[in-house]
């Protein structure tokens, strides 16, 4: 039975040219996290595997940095980065948990970052 829940940074906004941390947190389960996949709509961005470490898709290497933790840092943001991002937690024995984050990249220099929880 899957008892866990994923907390995410929810809907966030950031300034064009800036950077943002995408963060998810799996709670309420003792399941072992074996791998976390990060996807942007229809693109695999990165994978963090408990044994193999990080794999960043080559096409995103210049703008995506691993961490902090199981999170992902997007750099040099463009308006085209606006959209949905998903963290997919592969766990044992529970199975798969998915969290959703919506990022809006703003032209304006006024970009609020409304996180649901504090990023360590």
């Amino acid at each position: 039975m899957m008892t866990g829940t994923i907390e995410t940074t929810g809907n966030i906004s950031a300034e064009k040219g800036g950077s943002i941390i995408l963060q998810c947190h799996l709670s309420s389960t003792t399941a072992q996290v074996t791998q976390v996949n990060w996807e942007q709509q229809d693109q695999l961005l990165a994978i963090c595997n408990a044994d193999l470490g990080w794999h960043i898709s080559p096409s995103f290497k210049d703008r995506v940095a691993p961490g902090p933790g199981l999170g992902l840092t997007l750099q040099s943001l463009t308006v085209n980065d606006t959209g949905e991002y998903f963290c997919i937690y592969h766990t044992y024995p529970d199975g798969t948990y998915t969290g959703r984050i919506f990022l809006e990249v703003l032209e304006s220099s006024v970009a609020e970052h409304g996180a649901r929880f504090q990023i360590p």
Partner: antibody
């Protein structure tokens, strides 16, 4: 250098059993998911089974479910495929393949031929 | 199950030609799409993973593109050693499935 070496193939009668082995070397075996893929003579590739690197999660094609069992012995760096109740349609070259991140298969063995015939 | 449909099933081309092979998934698979090359009597070889990432050691004339349901493998300038059969494969969900293959033959 990554190497995967399959063995255990051969001729078996319908209803019989075989156990295939895949000896791995050149990498940290227990960090990788592993797969069995087969290819019937003159046909395309067909995935048979996968085992995840850490948890031992196992997945099977419907065509072999209940008859084949995938397993691994990380202390021996070896992947296995126990094949029971074999049928003529199981005749194929069986490949083992390494599956980093359970997303792609980057190294393949040379294959071992299984022939099911009376 | 996710069905993978490859086209064409075979093609004839000359050395130096630009060759394009397409693969369509029966549902969205994000970019969980890999391409393999297989020569007669040999094991498959990974060319492209995650739709567009070139596997180490594979010549840059090979490229992959697409996401969602439609994917393409392109060989920019066909070389003699490229005559082989090419397969796409989805790893979005089990059962993992392969396309039927595209045989690239010498014209």
């Amino acid at each position: 250098e990554v190497q995967l070496l399959e063995s255990g193939g051969g001729l078996v009668q319908p209803g019989g059993s075989l156990r295939l082995s895949c000896a791995a070397s050149g990498f940290t075996f227990d960090s990788y998911g592993m797969n069995w893929v087969r290819q019937a003579p003159g046909k395309g590739l067909e995935w048979v089974a996968s085992i995840k690197y850490s948890s031992g999660y196992k997945y099977y094609a419907d065509s072999v479910k209940g008859r084949f069992t995938i397993s691994r012995d990380n202390s021996k760096n070896t992947l296995y495929l126990q094949m029971n109740s074999l049928r003529a349609e199981d005749t194929a070259v069986y490949y083992c393949a390494r599956g980093p991140y359970d997303v792609w298969m980057d190294y393949w063995g040379q294959g071992t031929l299984v022939t099911v015939s009376s | 199950d996710i069905q993978m449909t490859q086209s064409p099933s075979s093609l004839s081309a000359s050395v130096g030609d630009r060759v394009t092979i397409t693969c369509r998934a029966s549902q969205s698979i994000s970019s969980y799409l890999n391409w393999y090359q297989q020569k007669p009597g040999k094991a498959p070889k990974l060319l492209i993973y995650a739709a567009s990432s070139l596997q180490s050691g594979v010549p840059s004339r090979f490229s992959g593109s697409g996401s969602g349901t439609d994917f393409t493998l392109t060989i920019s300038s066909l070389q003699p050693e490229d005559f082989a059969t090419y397969y796409c494969q989805q790893s979005y969900s089990t059962p993992l499935t392969f396309g039927g293959g595209t045989k690239v033959e010498i014209k």
